[in-house]
């Protein structure tokens, strides 16, 4: 019998300085582009090599971005979220939610799947 897969959810404030090529990541999500079932939140889909986010090291693919410079990302159209990041200025503060997969149950059995993917 497989063990149960649980997720440890943590929040973190990440302050990024916009680099020469920007912040260095891609996003998915929004009210018109639900990436996760029943969740119109904004998620990190790609961290660009040598970009500001990658060099900082804390933002991860799969993270949910809750706010940008204190502005909530709830109930935004996808393009409105993109524009918010693009107009966020040089110093950008991100409130993010990390989901860490943890395994409960019999040792040696790994759960499969990630509802966020």
């Amino acid at each position: 019998m497989n063990g149960r897969v649980d997720y440890l959810v943590t929040e973190e404030e990440i302050n990024l300085t916009r680099g020469p090529s920007g912040l260095g990541f891609n996003i998915v999500g929004g009210t018109d582009q639900q990436y996760v079932s029943n969740d119109s939140g904004i998620y990190v889909s790609r961290i660009k090599e040598n970009g500001a986010a990658a060099l900082d090291g804390r933002l991860q693919e799969g993270d949910k971005i809750l706010s940008v410079n204190g502005q909530d990302l709830k109930n935004l159209l996808h393009q409105d979220a993109v524009d918010l990041f693009r107009n966020a200025g040089y110093a950008v503060s991100l409130r993010v939610q990390h989901r860490l997969q943890v395994q409960n149950g019999p040792i040696g059995h790994r759960g499969e799947g990630d509802p966020s993917g």
Partner: nanobody, 127 residues
């Protein structure tokens, strides 16, 4: 892992038309930014066109503007490149590329590094 498979290439006379297709795997195709690049023998890979997740925004290289049209059908997980008024200088291997999501940065359309996944290419020859 995303897989991209191009089709529709071939030999066509100057002034003719071709329609390339790129079929993508993955249930989240509707979130991908998609693009076409091309590479002629002895030359670097060159950006042709791209399209955002819902088809609402497209961008073209100057060399193909007004002749080529990029489009997508998210229900079919497919992106297309309609090529009209073809010229001998359009001869190349045409590659489909995908990036998951939308960049939050000012977009470097022509940079292959913006894209994570690539097809094997389809040959287009204009005689």
């Amino acid at each position: 892992q995303v897989q991209l498979v191009e089709s529709g290439g071939g030999l066509v006379q100057t002034g003719g038309s071709l329609r390339l297709s790129c079929a993508a795997s993955g249930r989240t195709f509707s979130t991908y930014t998609m693009a076409w690049f091309r590479q002629a023998p002895g030359k670097e890979r060159e950006f042709v066109a791209d399209i955002n997740w819902n088809g609402g925004s497209t961008y073209y290289a100057d060399s193909v503007k007004g002749r080529f049209t990029i489009s997508r059908d998210n229900a079919k997980n497919t992106v297309y490149l309609q090529m009209n008024s073809l010229k001998p200088e359009d001869t190349a291997v045409y590659y489909c590329a995908a990036a998951i999501g939308s960049t939050v940065d000012s977009y470097y359309h022509s940079d292959p590094l913006e894209y994570d996944y690539w097809g094997q290419g389809t040959q287009v020859t204009v005689s």
